[in-house]
């Protein structure tokens, strides 16, 4: 029951995460005009991965696609690639995980096959989440660099009478959507990997053996059976579990390296 819940929850969390990654990739507000110097601007600029937009205070919004591939910054291309890879892996992961769900019966699919599919989809979700987090973080880093560069430019060459205000860009809503969505996909993937362990059949399943002693009829059940039911202690099983817990921690701590970029 707990395995089914973990798998189901992992699937739902990943589904929300991937929907968020798709939404973030399509959103126009990856970077928005910084209004610190001019909060009452009549023209507001914002940019996405695919087009840049201008919203006028009159209510009109005009968006223009980036109709060039070669003319775009390499970093932007890299972010696009990371987000698309994340979406593709996530979509495949979702497809695989649907068939892997314990609550769905497809023919006579064995638990071992479902366990493998669950693990595969979990890994795909983890990589998908990491791709999204990496993509958003690369873009955020690019924004921070450009922000401080334009700030430096803003305060140079002001000796003349005419001021040219440089437009600075700051974090847009899509970045936060992307970070949260990537995190959710990652968590969903970890949950699927945890569920996979519960689905996998045990390596040692000893059947109950009856020994007929002279004059007595005693049914002797070896300790191995006791362990295989999931109760009691089995050092081998415990070791696998502990190792799994460490891997889970490592996976969860790894993306946080990108969070502050």
């Amino acid at each position: 029951m707990a395995v089914t819940a973990c798998q189901g929850l992992g699937f739902v969390v990943s589904l929300i995460g991937i929907a968020g990654i798709i939404a973030a990739t399509c959103m126009d507000q990856w970077s928005t005009q910084d209004l610190y110097n001019n909060p009452v601007t009549a023209v507001f600029n914002y940019q996405g991965l695919w087009r840049s937009c201008v919203r006028e205070s009159s209510g009109f919004t005009e968006c223009r696609g980036y109709f060039t591939l070669l003319g775009l910054p390499a970093m932007l291309q890299a972010v696009r690639a990371l987000m698309i890879v994340g979406i593709v892996l996530g979509a495949i992961g979702l497809l695989v995980s649907i068939f892997a769900l314990k609550c769905i019966r497809i023919g006579s699919m064995e638990d071992s096959a479902k366990a493998n599919m669950t693990l595969t989809s979990g890994i795909m979700f983890i990589v998908s989440g990491l791709c999204a987090i990496a993509g958003v973080s690369v873009f955020a880093n690019m924004l921070v660099t450009n922000f401080w560069m334009s700030t430096a430019n803003m305060y140079t060459g002001m000796g003349g009478m005419v001021q040219t205000v440089q437009t600075r860009y700051t974090f847009g809503a899509a970045l936060f959507v992307g970070w949260v969505a990537g995190g959710l996909t990652l968590i969903g993937g970890v949950m699927m990997c945890i569920a996979c362990r519960g689905l996998a059949p045990e390596e040692t399943n000893y059947k109950a053996v009856s020994y007929h002693a002279s004059g007595h009829s005693v049914a002797y059940k070896p300790g191995g059976f006791k362990a295989s039911t999931g109760f009691g202690s089995n050092t081998k099983n415990k070791k696998i579990y502990d190792g799994g817990a460490r891997t889970e921690d490592e996976v969860q701590s790894y993306p946080s390296k990108h969070d502050y970029v």
Epitope: Q33, A42, V43, N45, Q47, C53, V54, G59, F60
Partner: antibody, heavy 118, light 113 residues
Framework: QVTLRESGPALVKPTQTLTLTCTFS????????MSWIRQPPGKALEWLAT????????YYLDSLKDRFTISRDISKNQVVLTVTNMDPADTATYFC???????????WGQGTTVTVSS | DIQMTQSPSTLSASVGDRVTITCKSS????????????LTWYQQKPGKAPKLLIY???TRESGVPSRFSGSGSGTAFTLTISSLQPDDFATYYC?????????FGGGTKVEIK
Amino acid sequence: QVTLRESGPALVKPTQTLTLTCTFSGFTFSSYGMSWIRQPPGKALEWLATISGGGSYTYYLDSLKDRFTISRDISKNQVVLTVTNMDPADTATYFCARQSRGNAMDYWGQGTTVTVSS
Amino acid sequence: DIQMTQSPSTLSASVGDRVTITCKSSQSLLNSGNQKNYLTWYQQKPGKAPKLLIYWASTRESGVPSRFSGSGSGTAFTLTISSLQPDDFATYYCQNDYSYPLTFGGGTKVEIK
């Protein structure tokens, strides 16, 4: 076709409050910003206030923002400018205009002349 | 606030003349997002409301005769009437539409010579 018409008192006393109404037709308010502009006799145009297309934002001339309030009434297709503490220097022809592409004012009302005198 | 300075304040010309009015802003009106200059030109006749001629510094409003043209970028702009017609004698205003407050120029009165 697009029409805008300003209405309000022609004469107000100093310190009184002026309420000007701009009634428009021929377009939906949500798609366009609306502005108030005034012109003192023999002088240049002076922008006063704007309310954005969605109605979420209002903008005022800094020196007058404490006395001016721009608002809208969607049901009546009206934009209202309220000016408190009127002064003889506020004597002018007041225009309302529709703000369109490029933030330019493409349609104007005929204007209403307001005289501030005791 | 962005200051708008128009010159000349008065201009005497004859029908058929080529007329040029200049407008200078204290800050650039060029928006980097769409590479458009947020400068607008209006025509006003005595006792009437202003009429929009040109927006985005060079885009002619529909119904405006082709003899009116706008040019310039950044802080220096020009309104040109290629061949002055009797109907063109009026006062012309430029306006900053880039940043609030939306300031107007002092106006240029085009009168008959």
